[in-house]
């Protein structure tokens, strides 16, 4: 038989790890192997999640808390508790349909997942580009040509005919 | 080192009470470990007497047989479980055994201490 | 819930293949463990859920069965599995932890 110091709702009683077994007259049943409840008063224990395949357990399951996944290397986690796993590109890359491709000219990717964006176009804040954009790295504007008085600055503003944004191919 | 150390055997007279002390080091008591008391009698097979949940519930698992004569405890804050026993017979004498039921080894017993002798006679 | 273990004691020679048996008086599903115990000592897991081999115990011991019967088996036996064997239903509540009758393994 089983104790419990509780006058209240008997399944109330139940911890976190156990679940209330209506088949057993309502006694606080340890959760099966494999099986987590991480709150009291539950009916029923949830299944682990298994750790499968392209994902591996970043936290091992136990009977009051779900396992935790993370991906293999070569991917990463997408979605709400690594519903998912994606694969990773290069730097300068974004995944497609039909795989890893480089970025388009003028635009930039500086991780290994998620898509290519534009360069920042400098001279819409009014300011000229500094370092020129690649594929891996997004251009580093300055301040504009008017802002330089001569001999104020050391930096030598880029050639005016480049369009802003645009790295010599 | 991960161990359960029992304590507080002897001899006692039919009727009298002893209470054994199985104190756990190197883990600690949750709900994914609930200690267990198991006996057995001399030259006898293993006899489960029942499990105390490892967390902070008092909810205790026990052998009908026990009939509310002995009564399983615990102290978290010494990550020790105890076996009341009361109004014990010839019969109660057997080597008592502290063991942890584990969640990680479907709830067998993966842990077991070295013993303690428990011997009632007049 | 009774846990019945048959035979209760047999004989055997190294290298045999040994086979032990415990049925439940009602259905546990796979919450069953067996364990081994050698005179003097304390009971040692050798398999949990049914099947599932404990760590550090030898590939020769295996374990089966579902519901109400399981089966242990040792593939080759060794000197020092000699012992006294037991099952236990892991099914906890209302008696739910009860050990086998135990089964004793002695050289032929």
């Known amino acids: 038989f089983e104790r419990t110091r509780s006058l209240q709702d008997p399944c109330s009683n139940c911890p976190a790890g156990t679940f209330c077994d209506n088949n057993r007259n309502q006694i606080c049943s340890p959760c099966p192997p494999n099986s987590f409840s991480s709150a009291g008063g539950q009916r029923t224990c949830d299944i682990c999640r298994q750790c499968k395949g392209v994902f591996r357990t970043r936290k091992e399951c136990s009977s009051t808390s779900n396992a935790e996944c993370d991906c293999t290397p070569g991917f990463h986690c997408l979605g709400a508790g690594c519903s998912m796993c994606e694969q990773d590109c290069k730097q300068g890359q974004e995944l497609t349909k039909k795989g890893c491709k480089d970025c388009c000219f003028g635009t930039f990717n500086d991780q290994k997942r998620g898509i290519c964006r534009p360069w920042t176009n400098c001279s819409l804040d009014g300011k000229s580009v500094l370092v020129n954009g690649t594929k891996e790295r997004d251009v580093v504007c300055g301040p504009s040509p008017a802002d330089l008085s001569p001999g104020a600055s050391s930096v030598t503003p880029p050639a005016p005919a480049r369009e802003p944004g645009h790295s010599p191919q | 080192e991960v161990q359960l150390v029992e304590s507080g055997g002897g001899r006692v007279q039919p009727g009298g009470s002893l209470r054994l002390s199985c104190a756990a080091s190197?883990?600690?008591?949750?709900?994914?470990?609930?200690p267990c008391w198991v006996r057995q009698a001399p030259g006898k097979g293993l006899e489960w007497i029942g499990c105390?949940?490892?967390?902070?519930?008092?909810?205790?698992y026990d052998a009908q047989w026990t009939k509310g004569r002995f009564t399983i405890s615990r102290d978290n804050s010494k990550n020790t479980v105890y076996l009341q026993m009361n109004s014990l017979r010839a019969e109660d004498t057997a080597t008592y055994y502290c063991?942890?039921?584990?969640?990680?080894?479907?709830?067998?017993?993966?842990?077991w201490g070295q013993g303690t002798q428990v011997t009632v006679s007049s | 819930i009774q846990m019945t273990q048959s035979p209760s004691s047999l004989s055997a020679s190294v290298g045999d293949r040994v086979t032990i048996t415990c049925q439940a008086s009602?259905?546990?599903?796979?919450?069953l463990a067996w364990y081994q115990q050698k005179p003097g000592k304390a009971p040692k897991l050798l398999i949990y859920?049914?099947?599932t081999l404990a760590s550090g115990v030898p590939s020769r011991f295996s374990g089966s069965g579902s519901g109400t019967d399981f089966t242990l088996t040792i593939s080759s036996l060794q000197p020092e599995d000699f012992a006294t064997y037991y099952c236990q239903s892991t099914y906890y509540g209302n008696d739910g932890n009860a050990f086998g009758t135990g089964t004793k393994v002695t050289v032929l």
């Open positions: 105390i949940y490892g967390g902070s519930s008092d909810i205790t």
């Open positions: 009602q259905s546990i599903s796979n919450r």
């Open positions: 859920s049914a099947s």
């Open positions: 063991a942890r039921s584990a969640w990680y080894s479907g709830w067998g017993g993966d842990l």
């Open positions: 190197g883990f600690s008591f949750s709900a994914n470990y609930y």
